[in-house]
Amino acid sequence: PKQTLPKPIIRAESTYMVPKEKQATLCCQGSYGAVEYQLHFEGSLFAVERPKPPERINGVKFHIPDMNSRKAGRYSCIYRVGELWSERSDLLDLVVTEMYDTPTLSVHPGPEVTSGEKVTFYCRLDTATSMFLLLKEGRSRDVQRSYGKVQAEFPMGPVTTAHRGSYRCFGSYNNYAWSFPSEPVKLLVTGDIENTSLAPTDPTFPDSWDTCLLTRETGLQKDLALWDHTAQNHHHHHHHH
């Protein structure tokens, strides 16, 4: 079989949901000593980076200017060390947001509920869309989908304090083009069996895997690079829509 290098890891810097006309940054984490990185979009070559040898680093950042629906979709990357190419990375779904209109998010029976109550979110958008998405802040990879003509419902079932947090919804014009986000709705869940009034809410900072972790090479890193890279690929769980 043809020898290949371990596949790189592709990430979106800060978020995979990019407002239209803003710049997206994608990171391709490969291997120290890589002489070329390629970013592919929907199967076609999009951009090329050839890092300078004096600045050995285990990956590169690709910029995507002026985000729009033509640039939203599935990205992947590969890299080369000498003449040997890597396997292709997993696919990264890049979404453009702030398209067209803003939906309205509401929650029933209300934003303050007790543990065990059944809660349903409603997302409404009057313009032509049939798919709606509900996201919890700090959990942007856990997208819930629902369908409806102008309104979709998201039944949460009996809630616990784990459901506490801030929610937003989007209308989706296709898998990769979303509306403006709704105003956030903060769900407060109280009254678990044990006292949970001091239980922390979910973090609102970006998902940890939406951060580019590129490092400069040191002697030790050079020796461990391939082992480390293989281990990261093994443990990296990537979201697919």
Partner: nanobody, 127 residues
């Protein structure tokens, strides 16, 4: 923002050489990666060649590799496309494009990567 103006196109015979130029306005030319694209009648715009901000990374379409050379003169705010051994299938409008990546060694291959475009210059190669 940057304005791009192409020049140097014309009518040549197959096998001849031609150099087209793209002059950029402004004093920050060295912060732009540059690309050349072409569009033949009835066809989609296609990538030809690209140069990184510092000129150390160049990339070519397979169809022009070994015949075309992209170069840039940051002091003159100009990028060039030297076209040798021209063929009739090279006939097209040639467009210059620019974008500002953070990296000095990155180039764009897809037209969507580029932010700014010139109006184009016609190159016709007769047999």
């Amino acid at each position: 923002q940057v304005q791009l103006v192409e020049s140097g196109g014309g009518l040549v015979q197959a096998g001849d050489s031609l150099r087209v130029s793209c002059a950029a306005s402004g004093r920050t030319f060295s912060t732009y990666a540059m690309g050349w694209f072409r569009q033949a009648p009835g066809k989609e715009r296609e990538f030809v060649a690209a140069s990184s901000r510092d000129g150390t990374t160049t990339y070519y379409a397979d169809s022009v590799k070994g015949r075309f050379t992209i170069s840039r003169d940051n002091a003159k705010n100009t990028v060039y496309l030297q076209m040798n051994s021209l063929k009739p299938e090279d006939t097209a409008v040639y467009y210059c494009a620019a974008s500002r990546p953070l990296s000095t060694t990155q180039v764009g291959i897809a037209s969507a990567w580029y932010e700014y475009w010139g109006q184009g210059t016609q190159v016709t190669v007769s047999s």
